[in-house]
């Protein structure tokens, strides 16, 4: 094909890959027809003047995971049609100036994972035609105004996992095109207002995993086609009351991992969108009424891991389109009555490792659909009757590690999952906690006539006598409630991310990995 | 007879991590849980954490991130692994249980303690 | 988290006398629904893990004699000891389990 080197493969659609630690410089002679090149995994350590010059032609050119760590200015002569270039995974600290100068074809710059200390306005006043530039993984600490004043075209600027410490307000301003910028793991402080004003088309936002601590009000009033926005990780404590307001495309939000006190009424202002909002490890320590009534697409909301101890009968008002609603990990004693009554189509709620003492008797009386409850590890002894009559779609049940008073009072109860054991699950059932000499024995087939009788002794049962037998298999695997692999925060659909951890970890949510994003 | 009995104490370097066992006996880890106590020489009592029948767990908020406890109900032994030690780590390490009181957070049966000493 | 806070640290009381020791917490350990106070009251002998005396702010552990009382609502609770034996030498330490447990800091009791 042209002479293709001995180190390299070379394929009829003129695509030319040369990959080895036994390559030190690039082969040569190269097809004079190859429109892709990629040289991976090699020992190059520098690129001289015009490597390239007879493969005119190249569009693709993918120098990746190799000892490069100097560049001649001429390295990239001659390649007028080149649109991809990939520099990523090398050992560059220094771009020289005029790098890419005649690249007037490239669309695609990719200088991710190197060692980059600084970039300079002169490095990509070229790029005129650039639509991506992916600088993350070096260790840049600012960026110079008039960075990217040239990239009038720019679609999509990742600047994430470097060291930025600032960010100049006027550093953004010329890229009216941008749709994706990312900002995530760097040390950002605070954003100035401004900072994202010229960012009229902008679709997504990544500033996880910084140091962020106030949010300017205004700061995303002009990005009205954002969709995902992504905050957690930071350290923001409050949240400014119209910050949100003006996002009306909006359909992610991740919040958790900050340091949020409170939430305050129409907060989230009309998302119509959006569909989960995680807020899961924050401080948050109380929830007012219509704090998401705005939201009234919302699927799935995350509030575990906070120190909530108060919710309002009204804060749930206006999510009525809600599946999954997580509040295990917080410091609730008590809910009201009606605190779900507006949450129609609720499926799963997690309710584990509070501090319930007693659930109201109407507590679940308007979510028909619920399949799944949560309540174990709280301070449970006994339950209202007729809790559970009308959940007929309910298929997964956890009461256990919860002090189950076993005295009569819990015949009705006892009844109950006595008919219905296959929703408590095998691993682990509820035992019961007093009097003493029951003290470890399961609550289902204790034998109550032992304990010691209650005060009050009730007609026995109003927990329906039918057993359940479900018309199709329980849980599907790939929902169960119990599935002890889950993503332990939502994966944030990123292209270029290498990896997402999966954990065994159950406690971010108490929910499912298919549920999990 | 109910009887706890912790051990894995000794020296260990600052940075360093620790791993307890309390093996009991009397009763099952099955219905029963088991709380974590500590108590540095002269000074206080300071819970750490409870594992409860049904394997639940819930830590002290300050320790959270250090702090895991574990069982195996087979073994009938509770194990506390502390990670990222320091100096005021030393201490006197107790497991509890909630045998006959009516306190569902009621610790009425312990063990001797096992000591634990951070230093380089 | 739950402060508790007891006074005095150490009490010094002739055989026979009454000792009394205080336990307030930074927010009320009573639960409006249950009617109960979360406190519960621990004595620590010289060398020995600490014993349970009384939950519930009030009500004494089987096997604990009936000099030893408690009482209190809310954030402010009291353990008393009518009339103070030589057994009764110990480091008394009250407990919250409204939240997460914490203990107070302990008051150490004497003969005088």
């Known amino acids: 094909y042209h002479g293709c080197p001995s180190e390299c493969t070379c394929s009829r659609a003129s695509q030319v890959e040369c990959t080895g630690a036994r390559i030190v410089a690039v082969p040569t002679p190269l097809p004079w027809n190859a429109m892709s090149l990629q040289i991976l995994n090699t020992h190059i350590t520098e690129l001289n003047e015009s490597p390239f010059l007879n493969i005119s032609a190249l569009i693709a050119l993918r120098i990746e995971k190799n000892e490069l760590s100097r560049i001649t200015p001429g390295a990239f002569r001659n390649l007028g049609s080149l649109r991809y270039l990939s520099l990523a995974n090398n050992k560059l600290q220094v771009l020289p100036i005029g790098l890419f100068q005649g690249l007037d074809s490239l669309e695609s710059l990719l200088l991710s994972s190197n060692q980059l200390l600084q970039i300079q306005p002169a490095h990509f006043s070229q790029c005129s035609n650039l639509k991506e530039l992916q600088l993350h993984g070096n260790h840049l600490e600012y960026i110079p105004d008039g960075a990217f004043d040239h990239l009038v075209g720019l679609t999509k600027l990742n600047l994430g996992k470097n060291s930025l410490t600032h960010i100049s307000p006027r550093v953004f301003q010329h890229l009216g095109n941008l749709q994706v910028l990312r900002l995530y793991e760097n040390r950002l402080t605070d954003i100035p207002m401004g900072t994202f004003d010229g960012l009229v088309n902008l679709q997504e936002l990544a500033l996880q995993q910084n140091q962020i601590g106030l949010l300017s009000p205004g700061l995303f009033h002009n990005n009205h086609n954002l969709q995902r926005l992504y905050l957690s990780n930071n350290h923001i404590s409050q949240l400014p009351p119209s910050v949100f307001m003006q996002l009306p495309q909006l359909n992610r939000l991740t919040l958790f991992g900050n340091s949020l006190k409170e939430l305050s009424p129409g907060i989230f202002g009309p998302m119509p969108n959006l569909r989960e909002l995680w807020l899961y490890d924050n401080h948050i320590s109380s929830l007012p009424d219509n704090v998401f009534s705005n939201l009234r697409q919302l699927q799935v909301l995350i509030l575990s891991r906070n120190q909530i101890s108060f919710i309002s009968p009204g804060a749930f008002n206006g999510l009525t389109e809600l599946r999954e609603l997580s509040l295990h990990t917080n410091a609730l004693q008590d809910l009201d009555g009606n605190v779900f009554r507006m949450l129609a189509n609720l499926q799963n709620i997690s309710l584990q490792n509070n501090r319930l003492r007693q659930l109201p008797g109407n507590i679940f009386a308007n979510v028909n659909g619920l399949m799944a409850i949560q309540l174990q590890n709280n301070q449970l002894e006994n339950l209202p009757l007729g809790i559970f009559d009308h959940l007929g779609k309910l298929c997964e049940l956890r009461l256990y590690d919860n002090p189950w008073r076993c005295d009569s009072d819990i015949l009705p109860l006892r009844n109950w999952l006595l008919l219905n054991q296959p929703r408590l699950g095998t691993d682990t059932v509820p035992v019961c906690f007093s009097p003493a000499n029951v003290r470890g024995q399961s609550l289902i087939i204790i034998n109550v006539n032992v304990a010691v009788p209650s005060v009050h002794v009730p007609e026995v049962p109003s927990y329906p006598e039918t057993p359940w037998y479900p018309d199709t298999p329980s849980y599907p695997d790939t929902t169960s409630v119990s599935s002890t692999t889950e993503l332990t925060s939502p994966v944030e659909d990123y292209t270029d991310l290498t990896t997402i951890q999966v954990t065994d970890d159950r406690s971010v949510w108490g929910m499912t990995q298919a549920q999990s994003g | 007879e109910v009887q706890l009995v912790e051990s894995g104490g000794g020296l260990v370097q600052p940075g360093g991590s620790l791993r307890l066992s309390c093996a009991v006996s009397g009763f099952s880890l099955t219905s029963y849980g088991v709380h974590w106590v500590r108590q540095a020489t002269g000074k206080g009592l300071e819970w750490l954490g409870v594992i409860w029948a049904g394997g639940s767990t819930n830590y002290n908020s300050a320790l959270m991130s250090r702090l895991t406890i574990s069982k195996e109900n087979a073994k009938s032994s509770v194990y506390l692994q502390m990670n990222s030690l320091r100096a005021g780590d030393t201490a006197m390490y107790y497991c509890a249980t909630h045998m006959i009181t009516e306190d569902y957070y009621g610790m009425d049966y312990w063990g001797q303690g096992t000591t634990v000493t951070v230093s380089s | 988290d739950i402060v508790m806070t007891q006074s005095p640290d150490s009490l010094a009381v002739s055989l026979g006398e009454r000792a009394t020791i205080n336990c307030k917490s930074s927010q009320s350990l009573l639960n409006s629904r249950t009617r109960k106070n979360y406190l519960a009251w621990y004595q620590q002998k010289p060398g020995q893990s600490p014993k349970l005396l009384i939950y519930h702010a009030s009500t004494r552990e089987s096997g604990v004699p009936d000099r030893f009382s408690g009482s209190g609502s809310g954030t402010d609770f009291t353990l008393t000891i009518s009339s103070l034996q030589a057994e009764d030498v110990a480091v008394y330490y009250c407990?919250?389990?409204?939240?997460?447990?914490?203990f107070g800091g302990g008051t150490k009791v004497e003969i005088k």
């Open positions: 407990k919250q389990s409204y939240n997460l447990p914490t």
